[in-house]
């Protein structure tokens, strides 16, 4: 049913879904704090622009009686229940922030006539791609896939002279929400990644992974997995690894690699870590002090969601345009706005662009070092270390298939 929006006459409200099922186990209080900090910034920016309006947030909590798994498995209905709650109360803001689970976002998008924008900190799965009124402020699976294909094909760097066309993917079903959807996208037979690779096998058992490390008959030297170094250690331990194995560890939302005095453990020497470039001020800002390095990005996405709304509100008000229109709902894409920690760019489909960073472990210094960066906006790789102090022979990444010569 059509719900009237609390979104006119100088008063603009943001509906924030505070769901029990969330992409990251972040206390809702921290998300509230992030939203409130964002509101303060937005009010200041609007005031500076001479716009005398009120901006508030309404936090919509689910009762948690039915949907209490805490992760995303039972989120599908929780999102719809919250929308029903909003509908019954006849209280919808100009914009909806949350949900973060792919299941709930997909279902809410499917089952509602969305004439308002939806901003998500999460919704990583491919099923949430190309949604006209959905904006995602954390890197979705599609962006990861494009990096991997780009990197696999690269063969003109001093440290990577072979194109790769094969891979193992380790996916055992215990992954976090972000990893679940990232690996899901790599596994999907119809995805861009699968389409571009000649060989790809999913390893589902710990033993399968462990066996591959020294298997002379393996079909690929490259293994993709998702999680932190501890996750890898639990799986790999101190087992011997063939010298031409390359493990790509996807750990996007983890700033720990960049903290002072971090030393890479020995078991990381065969590993390239794919993570996101950390914000400069975030490393010691008051906002992030109480958050773990992994959860910083999640709370930051909520905060940036508020700033994005403020940015769009300012533009529409300055142009004398109506906020409760399809034009406003479809406007949250193909733009750059001032985020909490610098400019944030959204692509044509409302998905955040970022700089991904591929790290290696220096055998000289036992420190993580940047091998290359990748700009998701232009799908381009920028090498940083032309002769890395790798564990691999001749400071070069091996071929993906043992014994295959130059291509």
């Amino acid at each position: 049913s059509q719900v009237s929006q609390n979104c006119h006459n100088g008063s603009y409200e943001i509906s924030v879904l505070m769901m029990g099922n969330s992409a990251f186990a972040e206390p809702l209080k921290n998300l509230e704090d992030a939203v409130n900090e964002g509101l303060e910034i937005v009010r200041g920016r609007l005031q500076n622009a001479g716009l005398n309006v009120t901006v508030n947030a309404t936090f919509m909590y689910s009762d948690g009686l039915i949907h209490n798994s805490g992760d995303c498995r039972s989120s599908t209905c929780e999102g719809l229940d919250l929308l029903r709650k909003i509908s019954n109360a006849q209280r919808m803001g100009c914009v909806l922030i949350g949900p973060s689970c792919t299941y709930s976002t997909f279902q809410m998008y499917l089952d509602t006539e969305l004439s308002y924008p939806m901003i998500s900190a999460g919704s990583f799965g491919l099923s949430c791609d190309y949604k006209e009124t959905l904006t995602r402020l954390m890197s979705p699976a599609r962006k990861l896939m494009y990096f991997l294909v780009n990197f696999w094909k690269t063969n003109d760097l001093p440290f990577k002279t072979y194109s790769w066309s094969t891979s193992y993917v380790y996916k055992n079903g215990t992954e976090t929400e972000d990893c679940f959807w990232y690996l899901n996208a790599l596994e999907a037979s119809v995805s861009y990644f699968s389409h571009e690779l000649g060989f790809k096998v999913v390893l589902r058992q710990d033993k399968e992974f462990q066996d591959i490390l020294m298997d002379h008959n393996r079909k690929s030297n490259v293994i993709i997995m998702c999680g932190g170094p501890e996750f890898l250690y639990k799986l790999k331990g101190d087992r011997a690894v063939a010298e031409d194995i390359v493990i790509i560890l996807v750990d996007l939302f983890n700033d720990q690699y960049f903290e002072d005095n971090v030393t890479a453990p020995d078991y990381m020497k065969n590993v390239l870590v794919l993570t996101l470039s950390p914000g400069n001020s975030l490393l010691n800002s008051s906002f992030s002090r109480n958050l773990s390095p992994t959860k910083r990005d999640f709370a930051l996405a909520y905060l940036n969601g508020i700033l994005l709304f403020g940015h769009m509100l300012k533009i529409f008000l300055e142009n004398g345009e109506n906020i409760t229109t399809p034009k406003f709902a479809h406007a949250f894409r193909n733009l750059t706005f001032e985020g909490y920690d610098g400019p944030v760019t959204l692509d044509d489909w409302g998905d955040v662009d970022s700089t991904m960073v591929l790290l290696y472990t220096s055998v000289d210094t036992k420190k993580y070092k940047v091998l290359l960066t990748y700009d998701t906006h232009v799908n381009k790789t920028y090498p940083v270390d032309m002769s890395p102090t790798f564990t691999w022979k001749n400071s070069k990444l091996p071929n993906d298939i043992t014994g295959r010569g130059p291509q």
Partner: nanobody, 127 residues
Framework: QKQLVESGGGLVQPGGSLRLSCAAS????????IGWFRQAPGKEREGVSC???????NYADSVKGRFTLFRASAENTVYLQMNSLKPEDTAVYYC?????????????????????WGQGTLVTVSS
């Protein structure tokens, strides 16, 4: 004091390219933040670009998109690739190092942040 040696300068036509290198003896350069500076005749020394210990780079607005800074860790060298050179790029180019994990490479390198300097290499852009 760390011994830094710059090389690769010379005379080049506008629109041309040069690659400067900064090498260190007896020190592992990738343990430090490296800054490149330049000083044109009669002008203050200014920051051009830097690379932090972990490998993040930053550039002055005047050189963004034209200059690229990268490492060659195994050679213990840092390179400054300069493309689309302009007459106003004419200067003596210096490299400098400082410890500290982040130092000022998130921002433009400031002179006072760097403790060891090379002798400089002259770049002249002229037709």
């Amino acid at each position: 004091q760390k011994q830094l040696v710059e090389s690769g300068g010379g005379l080049v036509q506008p629109g041309g390219s040069l690659r400067l290198s900064c090498a260190a003896s007896g020190e592992t350069l990738s343990n430090y933040n490296i800054g490149w500076f330049r000083q044109a005749p009669g002008k203050e020394r200014e920051g051009v670009s830097c690379i932090s210990q972990i490998g993040f780079t930053n550039y002055a607005d005047s050189v963004k998109g034209r200059f690229t800074l990268f490492r060659a860790s195994a050679e213990n060298t840092v390179y400054l690739q300069m493309n689309s050179l302009k007459p106003e790029d004419t200067a003596v180019y210096y490299c400098a190092v400082t410890g500290g994990r982040w130092a000022s490479c998130s921002f433009l390198p400031l002179r006072q942040d760097f403790e060891s300097w090379g002798q400089g290499t002259l770049v002249t852009v002229s037709s």
